[in-house]
Interface confidence: low
Amino acid sequence: MRTEAQVPALQPPEPGLEGAMGHRTLVLPWVLLTLCVTAGTPEVWVQVRMEATELSSFTIRCGFLGSGSISLVTVSWGGPNGAGGTTLAVLHPERGIRQWAPARQARWETQSSISLILEGSGASSPCANTTFCCKFASFPEGSWEACGSLPPSSDPGLSAPPTPAPILRADLAGILGVSGVLLFGCVYLLHLLRRHKHRPAPRLQPSRTSPQAPRARAWAPSQASQAALHVPYATINTSCRPATLDTAHPHGGPSWWASLPTHAAHRPQGPAAWASTPIPARGSFVSVENGLYAQAGERPPHTGPGLTLFPDPRGPRAMEGPLGVR
């Protein structure tokens, strides 16, 4: 069963509605409109699936539709991480992955999406109406979060209706760089729209685009977010709250974050081996989110793709350490 926060996408005007000239003159305004609307307003999609083979096992997939560099992903349940939710996993593109029971396996799927498998036994196991939230901290957009859950009555393997789209929140206020650069374009767009007032406006048509191909449309700039339409999120109080985690579970974990780069200049390369190259704490810290901080002016050694923090095929001791456990 899949419950997805499928982000509504902006659709270009259908070909053939206007003459070739008219279509061409609308291309630039449309691209600018996309950039203006999406700059600083990326989206996060969440997909929750209950495994048909293990009825109490969940797979959560999350993706970030934005142009910035992802610096941290936090997966929580029971609501947003900063509002009573409990952290299940934290993924950093260079520092690696931490997870807490009942999380069984967290991993990067692509440079901008992650997946998390949850165990389904014991008092801390999830249930069908649990809300799962994914928060992506990125530069320059800031921190963005979306939540999803399974309808209680859904059967495994069946599609479920879309969950609410992302929370309207940017904890770092989406550092103004990108938006500022596009300001001129937006003004120009308004000018063009005024000139074309007599023409029919392009339609904004929500579509159920698969999150697996977030940048598949040729009309959208490859580095711009497709997602521009938000649905406000309301916290869902579930009756299935995780129990306090302790070390009876065979998994556990440390608090090990080295200083996080504020401005990552590259796209994430997947979890990398880092334990042998820690970074001493120096300098000033800039708040990123949730008690994790980025150390200004210091970059971790960059390691390429293909390196994993936990070479053991069974993965890490699913980390039930201090970061965010309730």
Epitope: H251, S255, W256, A275, S276, A281, Y293, R317, G321
Partner: antibody, heavy 119, light 107 residues
Amino acid sequence: EVQLQQSGPELVKPGASVKISCKASGYTFTDYNIHWVKQSHGKRPDWIGYNYPYNGGAGYNQNFRSRATLTVDKFSSTAYMELRSLTSEDSAVYYCAGEEVRRGPFYFWGQGTSVTVSS
Amino acid sequence: DIQMTQSPDSLSASVGETVTITCRTSENIYSFLVWYQQKQGKSPQLLVYNAKTLAEGVPSRFSGSGSGTQFSLKINSLQPEDFGTYYCQHYYGTPYTFGGGTKLEIK
């Protein structure tokens, strides 16, 4: 200067409870987890559990789970450990230690609180 | 729980000598290991984290090495202030556990 200041020594009777405080200063309280460690005389330290000040959460060593309660007061930047149903085996020095959320180990320790359980 | 086995239990050495303390773990902990020094009646002090990174302010005569299940702490050119008890501790999953300690005494 980063500091963890613990409450003074305690002399308690068997079966009673004790509550030790650990006041943090010199840093943002929510930046660090506060761990609690027991050390009996001449023995290796024994990890009890931790407070997670950011959201008030706690995690426990299973050996202490039933008798220890770890709490925090963000407003006073103070962490507390309450230990119940004390026996002579609980006579020890109890330390709080700050664990930097990004890097792992216990970077700084309180001075320790001596607890003596005696009738 | 992960078991930490430290050796030797005690060690006598003279100022200027080099000593090595070892720590073995019951399972792979990668580099999630720290070393502490503790003086009588005092709190432990962090020396090394991530198995080989010196904590701030720790003299360079201390060095940590190892990964997986075998670790060591080496102290070059012992100084009078280096005497005390040394503990290893893992932080790869809770419960964090400590080694039994190595008491370093002046010969």
